[in-house]
């Protein structure tokens, strides 16, 4: 699987999950989140050659098409597969509120 | 929705489904399929700017990150959303066999 265990410990050039830290205030303009100040969101990057973690029948066909037509702009793209939630703390008035934000952290990628 | 109805009738530059015809023999090297000779597979293409048909919480965050950090390589990617099957006919010996190939045709796209 193209997950953090594999991708973070290798120098994989093809589609893989990459490290990305997002600072809520600086990168998103969100000043109201108290904790955490930011988080390891990660992102997916890298080419999707034929047979590389292809998602559907269609992406297999498209990767093969791309192999036969190297100049074509039609090619599978490296996108998130497994996403995880992130708990945050913010204040509603003086009272802290804990909220679980779904689908915020990329754990693995796929070619789609 | 970024579907064939909208995308094929517009000059949309952002993520949208585009027309692509795949010839089984020429583009994939598959000589064994009897009918059809090829099909309109389509593909997804175009940038994924802030708020453009974003798939998950994560893709919204990433698009916003990208807006604040225009030079970053982390950005959502335009990929298939709705896929449709394709019926094919091939021969097993002298006997024709009809098979439904799932997830072969792109009907709409999303930013993931």
């Amino acid at each position: 699987a193209l997950d953090t265990n594999y991708c973070f410990s290798s120098t994989e050039k093809n589609c893989c999950v990459r490290q990305l830290y997002i600072d809520f205030r600086k990168d998103l303009g969100w000043k109201w989140i108290h904790e955490p100040k930011g988080y390891h969101a990660n992102f997916c990057l890298g080419p999707c050659p034929y047979i590389w973690s292809l998602d559907t029948q269609y992406s297999k066909v498209l990767a093969l098409y791309n192999q036969h037509n190297p100049g074509a702009s039609a090619a599978p793209c490296c996108v998130p597969q497994a996403l995880e939630p992130l708990p945050i703390v913010y204040y509603v008035g003086r009272k802290p509120k804990v909220e679980q934000l779904s689908n915020m952290i990329v754990r693995s990628c796929k070619c789609s | 929705a970024l579907d064939t109805n909208y995308c094929f009738s517009s000059t949309e530059k952002n993520c949208c489904v585009r027309q692509l015809y795949i010839d089984f023999r020429k583009d994939l090297g598959w000589k064994w399929i009897h009918e059809p000779k090829g099909y309109h597979a389509n593909f997804c293409l175009g940038p994924c700017p802030y708020i453009w048909s974003l798939d998950t919480q994560y893709s919204k965050v990433l698009a916003l990150y990208n807006q604040h950090n225009p030079g970053a390589s982390a950005a959502p990617c335009c990929v298939p959303q709705a896929l449709e099957p394709l019926p094919i006919v091939y021969y097993v010996g002298r006997k024709p066999k009809v098979e439904q190939l799932s997830n072969m045709i792109v009907r709409s796209c999303k930013c993931s």
């Epitope: 109201w32 009272k95 909220e99 | -």
Partner: antibody
């Protein structure tokens, strides 16, 4: 420049629902909380609740809990407020207003023009 | 809920007068060195307009004749020299506790 443009006036019967829209422009819609405030004829201001468009997080005034739903469509930068089981005392001008961004509950620096909702049989 | 009591509920004044409006909260609205108190102006048929945020900060574009002060439970909005366009209703608002609440308003009329 920042603008919040609300939908037009509505007349509803008691027991019905109303959905008011607020289209934002001139700023990053997903970076600020959107509040809804109402004002009955000749009365003061009453905060109904708020939503953070990027995440869909909401905080509602308990007084409206169960009757109000706030949603957004980030693709069109539009916020919506739906109020159900309308009563005659829900007759008011409904405003959307952007929070200034330091906290969830905050001062509100930009306001829509208001939408008059009249509840009458 | 925090109750916000404004006084007076209405007042008559002349152009050039110094006008003071007070707002008292039912409990302190201070937190970490900030006073979570704001002031708005509203003219008939119009939406409220933010004047002062966090007790004493003047909103961008608001004339300097408007000022705010106070802490804890007692706050004041002052108009140093009343102008014709200042005749309106003024509201205080707290955001220290959920739900966010407003004062009942002070109507400033022409004498």
């Amino acid at each position: 420049q920042v603008q919040l443009v609300q939908s037009g006036a509505e007349v509803k019967k008691p027991g019905a629902s109303v959905k008011v829209s607020c289209k934002a422009s001139g700023y990053t819609f997903t970076s600020y909380w959107m509040n809804w405030v109402r004002q009955a004829p000749g009365q003061g201001l009453e905060w109904m609740g708020q939503i953070f468009p990027a995440l869909g997080s909401t905080n509602y005034n308990e007084m409206f809990e169960g009757r109000v739903t706030m949603t957004t469509d980030t693709s069109t930068s539009t916020a919506y407020m739906e109020l159900r089981s309308l009563r005659s005392d829900d007759t008011a001008v409904y405003y959307c207003a952007r929070g200034i961004g330091n906290y969830a509950l905050d001062a509100m620096d930009y306001w829509g023009q208001g939408t008059l909702v009249t509840v009458s049989s | 809920d925090i109750q916000m009591t404004q006084s007076p509920s209405s007042l008559s004044a002349s152009v050039g007068d110094r006008v003071t409006i007070t707002c008292r909260a039912s409990e302190s609205v201070d937190w970490y060195g900030n006073s979570f108190m704001h002031w708005y102006q509203q003219k008939p048929g119009k939406a409220p307009k933010l004047l002062i945020y966090y007790a004493s900060n003047l909103e961008s574009g608001v004339p300097s004749r408007f000022s705010g002060s106070g802490s804890g439970t007692d706050f004041t909005l002052t108009i140093s020299s009343l102008q014709p366009e200042d005749f309106a209703t003024y509201y205080c608002q707290q955001n220290a506790e959920d739900p966010l609440t407003f004062g009942g308003g002070t109507k400033v009329e022409i004498k």
